[in-house]
Interface confidence: medium
């Protein structure tokens, strides 16, 4: 299953990055799982994951750094709390969980660049 | 003449981006001209230019947003005062001006990403 995502995204100076993950659904899925993976220095780690019913909001864990909304075959993902050291390739993985058959699609990744802001001067 | 430069550079939160432009000199040039071009939306504009004698500092115009140093066939370029709207492909053009023959080399460009910082809160 084909998954499309932007090649590059810049995090805001507040450490927030948003991008769209779009999948070409071969069937009429009602339950979809979206996972964000980070690849840096050939290491792949899971950033966050959410399962949602088509037409409903994505529910990430309470302590997740991700939030998202879905619209049709598009998922709008937002990752927050990013620091310069979090710069890396963020890969969108989409699984159509229900009904069968199961489909899996993995995007090529979105390179997220993060720049740490300069500290504000102390207010005297 | 081959000119090498990095594919991507992030400007700091102060709007400063630095990158190295390296050229493979076919001869013993004594005078070199370096020009930085910006390509965005298929428009190419000249950002800055400097001519220097090998072994000496690069002299950009006083009001230039560029500064630089040279070491052998490498030029270390710094562009300052960048804003998010300045994000684009910055191309390094190198000309061996003297002695003859004249050589010209153009790099593939460095994509510079710039994020505007959040304003600091007013100090009361």
């Amino acid at each position: 299953m084909h998954v499309a995502q932007p090649a590059v995204v810049l995090a805001s100076s507040r450490g927030i990055a948003s991008f769209v993950c779009e999948y070409a659904s071969p069937g009429k899925a009602t339950e979809v799982r979206v996972t964000v993976l980070r690849q840096a220095d050939s290491q792949v780690t899971e950033v966050c994951a959410a399962t949602y019913m088509m037409g409903n909001e994505l529910t990430f864990l309470d302590d997740s750094i991700c939030t998202g909304t879905s619209s049709g075959n598009q998922v709008n993902l937002t990752i927050q709390g990013l620091r310069a050291m979090d710069t890396g390739l963020y890969i969108c993985k989409v699984e159509l969980m229900y009904p069968p058959p199961y489909y899996l699609g993995i995007g090529n990744g979105t390179q997220i660049y993060v720049i740490d802001p300069e500290p504000c001067p102390d207010s005297d | 003449m081959h000119v090498a430069q990095p594919a991507v550079v992030l400007a700091s939160s102060r709007g400063i981006a630095s990158f190295v432009c390296e050229y493979a000199s076919p001869g013993k040039a004594t005078e070199v001209r370096v020009t930085v071009l910006r390509q965005a939306d298929s428009q190419v504009t000249e950002v800055c230019a400097a001519t220097y004698m090998m072994g000496n500092e690069l002299t950009f115009l006083d009001d230039s947003i560029c500064t630089g140093t040279s070491s052998g066939n490498q030029v270390n370029l710094t562009i300052q005062g960048l804003r998010a709207m300045d994000t684009g492909l910055y191309i390094c053009k190198v000309e061996l001006m003297y002695p003859p023959p004249y050589y010209l080399g153009i790099g593939n460009g460095t994509q510079i990403y710039v994020i505007d910082p959040e304003p600091c809160p007013d100090s009361d």
Epitope: - | E31, R33, T51, N56, T59, M97
Partner: nanobody, 123 residues
């Protein structure tokens, strides 16, 4: 035989202007510069210009006041000095060299030296 001959020196009031000329015979290399020297001090680089005319260098003390230029057809270099100060008083030398990898304000970068022309600025 390469020779450099300076002219145009003299006395001027502070705030005044002078133009020095340097006539070269023969091929003098890649770079022409002006140095100056006051008694008991090292020679100091004032300004330099490349043979193509594209590259110019200036000492911080003269930036914005002095302009170096050349007329390649006449094989002559010029130093236009404006807004002159008493501290500009010195013997001015025209120099030239091949300048492969040297530094413009170092005397060792130059192969040829003129005899010098005296400039005096009075307050």
């Amino acid at each position: 035989q390469v020779q450099l001959q300076e002219s145009g020196g003299g006395s001027v009031q502070a705030g005044g202007s002078l133009t020095l000329s340097c006539a070269a015979s023969g091929y003098t290399g890649d770079l022409v510069a002006w140095f100056r020297q006051t008694p008991g001090k090292e020679r100091e680089g004032v300004a330099a210009i490349s043979r193509t005319g594209l590259t110019t260098y200036y000492a911080d003390s003269v930036k914005g006041r002095f302009t170096i230029s050349q007329d390649t057809a006449k094989n002559t270099g010029y130093l236009q000095m404006n807004s002159m100060k008493p501290e500009d008083t010195a013997m001015y030398y025209c120099v030239a060299g091949w300048h492969v990898g040297g530094t413009w304000y170092k005397t060792s970068s130059y192969d040829y030296w003129g005899q010098g022309t005296q400039v005096t600025v009075s307050s």
